[in-house]
């Protein structure tokens, strides 16, 4: 796996342990928590990153209305089970044998149950809506400049192909970035929108996952873009299955 040869670190994932024990003395990096080898030329999967995080010491341009089936990650952090490719296993359970089904970004999409709960397949999240509110500025950002800058960020920093950035909406002070990626569209080697969104979320919170890179310095025509609130909505290819009790709560 590619990693910085000279000092043997993983540019795309600081939550790794690297050593020159790969073939021919090449640098090889393994994710904390899982010990899985990671490809340092691309983003690490969200599942492995969450696992590493849990193992670390504790310290008209109208805005889009999320659909009724949109999920928000209300459950927060948990120690996930990842498959050999680093993807989330469809069924997740905690130490007290409480289980639930998740989508491809690891967000719960069913009520919680016991060990008898079945999750037949990992349902793909094909549409992500990143909802940001920026801090007050002298004036509104120019929409096309903002659009270009956010597309540049996703392409250069996260190596996400621009075809997966469906739209950038702006109504001061709210910015919405829509990412779309169907199973049929995602080719081998393509960055997953879920992974890109997670790296972006961590960057926005000042918790960059990149090794030794400065934090995110977002500017639009030289004007700093400072985010004060982030909400991420996830839409799955198959709608989630929650009981009416939750839906009416």
């Amino acid at each position: 796996h590619t990693a910085a040869q000279d000092n043997c670190t993983c540019p795309t994932n600081k939550m790794t342990v690297c050593s020159p024990d790969g073939p021919g003395g090449r640098c090889q990096c393994r994710a904390l928590g899982s010990g899985m080898a990671v490809d340092c030329s691309t983003l690490t999967s969200k599942c492995l990153l969450l696992k590493a995080r849990m193992s670390a010491p504790k310290n008209a341009r109208t805005l889009v209305r999320p659909s009724e089936h949109a999920l928000v990650d209300n459950d927060g952090l948990y120690d996930p089970d990842c498959d050999p490719e680093g993807r989330f296993k469809a069924r997740q359970c905690n130490q007290t044998s409480v289980c639930w089904c998740v989508n491809s970004v690891g967000v719960r999409r069913t009520d919680k149950g016991d060990l008898s709960l079945r999750c037949d397949e990992l349902v793909r999240t094909h549409h992500i809506l990143i909802d940001l509110r920026h801090r007050p500025t002298a004036g509104a950002f120019n929409h096309s400049d903002l659009d270009a800058e956010l597309r540049r960020l996703f392409r250069e920093r996260y190596r996400l192909h621009p075809k997966f950035v469906a739209a950038v909406h702006y109504e001061q002070p709210t910015i919405q970035i829509e990412l779309r990626q169907n199973t049929s569209q995602k080719a081998a080697g393509d960055v997953d929108i879920g992974d890109a969104a997670y790296y972006f979320e961590r960057d926005i919170k000042g918790e960059s996952l990149f090794q030794g890179r400065g934090g995110l310095d977002l500017r639009v025509r030289g004007e700093p873009l400072q985010v004060e609130r982030t909400l991420i909505y996830y839409l799955d290819e198959i709608p989630p299955k929650f009981s009416m009790k939750r839906l009416t709560a």
Partner: antibody
Amino acid sequence: QVQLQESGPGLVKPSGTLSLTCAVSGDSISSNNWWSWVRQPPGKGLEWIGEIYPGGNPNYNPSLKSRVTISVDKSKNQFSLKLNSVTAADTAVYYCARGSGVISYFDYWGQGTLVTVSS
Amino acid sequence: DIQMTQSPSTLSASVGDRVTITCRASQSIGHWLAWYQQKPGKAPKLLIYKASSLESGVPSRFRGSGSGTEFTLTISSLQPDDFATYYCQQYSSYSPITFGQGSRLEIK
């Protein structure tokens, strides 16, 4: 086998517009690739002009952005370059190239066409 | 812009020699670097991408290495066909994509 072929006038007058077309064969212009223009002044190095992928906005070298337009014609499987307000400094061999990856490295090139800016 | 600086600008070598060309980036570009070979009157030809991946059909005597800001292209045993100009290119940023100034490899 992917092939690219540039065509257009070899001589352009100063302050005029340079127009070139690149015909693509062996690949669909609508494929998951970037389509770029790169130029090389006589005896000098390579300079990236800009790129496009179908369905997306073109990106241009900031040093040329005010003068350049790149467009795609899907029906003819070709893409084009327009550079206006040309001067002698724009005299170069112009190459079209296919870009691979999220940001391009160039795996296929046209043979290049020399464009001279002179009155 | 990310500046790419190649050295040497010109080098003389003989058939069978091992030669190394260096490319430095003005800021870290990870491993997003490509190497090209260009012969007079011809278009550039891709040799290496992602700093060390050999393009299909390119002889294994060509080898790329490095990451961050410093990269090298090594030709292990020069063949008569290898005398040409070599360019590096960064594709970490597209605003803009930039090339090195070139390194001309000539027969000693």
